[in-house]
């Protein structure tokens, strides 16, 4: 019985991509229900690791260090078999990072997106690193994998990503590796999210007191929707930042936010969008620009009360 | 029962180097990797690095990187750390600290602290 | 590196009262965070180990929850002792960095 029936599945939790210090389960899963297991790293030459050992459920491998990355099996206790032990598990790759300074990240044409749409994500670093990877925050697969291309002192990849649907939505990271050590990943880039758009109806945007205002008169602009949304954002034309507020349930059955942009020193177009809890990343439709105009003395810049998030952070839960 | 005892307080010139020991017993030295924290008057806790003791491996906090080294004595038990180059904001407690086991491990066990003065 | 932010960085209560502080990743951490007490002058202690266990010999007044990036320890029903100040710490890779500390002082 060497077959697929006496194969055993090895797995990692949380996660088969592990930070330098971190620490990482490996499971080595057997329909007959073993517990005891030897694990195998492949690069030494298929001997067991740990001098032999033998585990039982699981082994927490950590604090972990670059010598950690690499390829590992299982092999599953059959006391009845001639050798004693199952057929080699699947090949389970660990990846350790922060070994190299980290890449950059970009997405093309932006990281707001239509459903259906698909994005490039671009990882590139001054370091020539030989492999690109690109993982998305909170999935167990694999990070996939580029060849990266040098171009003028610059190595890049680039993952194209669509076409976009909601479970594609989140938080990216990219990391790079140098040839000899394809396993031993660099830091990770700084998260990117990449947002969803047009999957519920539009909100609806207004400003108090109106769309056109004296320089240096207060303004708010309100988002609400009679969709229970629990977020909402609101983006200005122009600018990379959107300002996010929980929404509030109104006495006329509408959830609405409302958002103090100040004094008024010049205009611009806004937009909102809604999102629920459970997804922050998929997005409503977009409210019907609205064009908030000032009359007076304009200057070059709005002020902001409200903190704008970072170009990362949209994908997190608001508390 | 599990004890980490430590080196006592010191008192150095600037530019001096002081090595701060970390006597461990009550279980294997080297089944456990471990860590050491420096508190600052006044301050916060700051992770410096560790030692692996069953191999020798260390890894820095990038910010203390030139400014320690650490070293461990199966034979004794001991993890020492070396803070060379002292200036006056190295004045601090410094604590050694076990890292437990488990997939999801904390600094179970801590040493008293060896408060270092840097003075000239 | 993983930044932890803790708030509030002082808080008062009274004898009897529940108070909670929390702490932020700013990435996802897997629950690889504990809870810290530390008394003046004394080494801390550990409180609450993966997010969520209580560590031995620690009163049930105190517990931990959370997930992903936010964390919370919560003190029920607040005793003398319990004044100190409160650290949170990751430990999903290094630099195992700590939080900025919360002093809990006697109102």
């Known amino acids: 019985l060497m077959g697929g029936q006496d194969k055993p599945f090895l797995s990692a939790r949380p996660s088969t991509v592990v930070p330098r210090g971190g620490h990482v389960a490996l499971q080595c899963h057997y329909r007959r229900g073993f517990n005891n297991f030897m694990l195998y790293k492949e690069d030494r030459s298929h001997v067991p690791i740990f001098h032999g050992r033998i585990f039982q459920e699981s082994f927490i491998m950590g604090p972990v260090t670059p010598a950690h990355a690499g390829t590992y099996r299982c092999r599953g206790s059959r006391p009845h078999s001639l050798t004693g032990w199952s057929a080699p598990s699947n090949p389970l790759v660990i990846m350790v990072t922060g070994n190299h300074r980290k890449p950059s990240l970009l997405a093309h044409p932006g990281p707001l997106l239509k459903s259906g749409e698909t994005v490039i994500l671009q990882c590139w670093s001054d370091v020539m690193f030989e492999h690109f990877f690109l993982h998305r925050e909170g999935i167990s697969e694999d990070p996939s994998r580029l060849v990266g291309q040098i171009h003028d002192g610059v190595s890049k990849a680039n993952f194209s990503i669509g076409p976009l649907m909601p479970v594609l939505a989140g938080t990216y990271r990219c990391y790079g590796s140098v040839p000899h050590s394809p396993y031993q990943l660099s830091a990770p880039s700084d998260p990117l999210d990449i947002v969803i758009t047009g999957l519920y109806e539009k909100p609806s945007l207004s400003a108090q007191p109106g769309p056109t205002v004296q320089a240096g008169e207060n303004v708010t602009l309100s988002c609400s929707s009679w969709s229970s949304y629990d977020i909402y954002h609101l983006s200005r034309e122009g600018e990379a930042h959107e300002r996010r507020l929980r929404a509030v349930p109104k006495v006329n059955r509408t959830f609405q936010a409302d958002f103090p942009l100040g004094p008024a020193t010049h205009g611009g177009t806004y937009r909102c969008f809604g999102s629920f809890r459970a997804l922050p990343c998929v997005w409503s439709n977009s409210s019907d620009p609205l064009l908030v105009s000032v009359t007076g003395n304009p200057s070059s810049s709005w002020p902001s009360p409200t903190e704008p998030s970072s170009k990362s952070g949209i994908c997190r839960h608001l508390h | 029962q599990v004890q980490l005892v430590q080196s006592g307080a010191e008192v150095k010139k600037p530019g001096a180097s002081v090595k701060v020991s970390c006597k461990a017993s009550g279980y294997t030295f080297t089944s456990y990797t471990m860590h050491w924290v420096r508190q600052a008057p006044g301050q916060g806790l700051e992770w410096i690095g560790y030692i692996n003791p069953s191999s020798g491996y260390t890894e820095n906090n990038r910010k203390f990187k030139d400014k320690t080294t650490m070293t461990a004595d199966t034979s004794t038990s001991t993890a020492y750390m070396e803070l060379s180059s002292l200036r006056s904001e190295d004045t601090a407690v410094y604590y050694c600290a076990r890292l437990g086991k488990g997939l999801l491990p904390p600094f179970d066990y801590w040493g008293q602290g060896t408060t270092v003065t840097v003075s000239s | 590196d993983i930044q932890m932010t803790q708030s509030p960085s002082s808080l008062s209560a009274s004898v009897g009262e529940t108070v909670t502080i929390t702490c932020r990743a700013s990435?996802?951490?897997?629950?690889?965070l504990a809870w810290y007490q530390q008394k003046q002058g004394k080494a801390p202690q550990l409180l609450v180990y993966a997010a969520t266990n209580l560590a031995d010999g620690v009163p049930s007044r105190f517990s931990g929850s959370g997930s992903g990036t936010q964390y919370t320890l919560t003190i029920n029903s607040l005793q003398p002792e319990d004044f100190a100040t409160y650290y949170c710490?990751?430990?999903?890779?290094?630099?195992?960095?700590f939080g900025g500390g919360t002093k809990l002082e006697i109102k």
């Open positions: 990435e996802n951490i897997y629950s690889n």
């Open positions: 710490q990751h430990f999903w890779g290094t630099p195992y960095t």
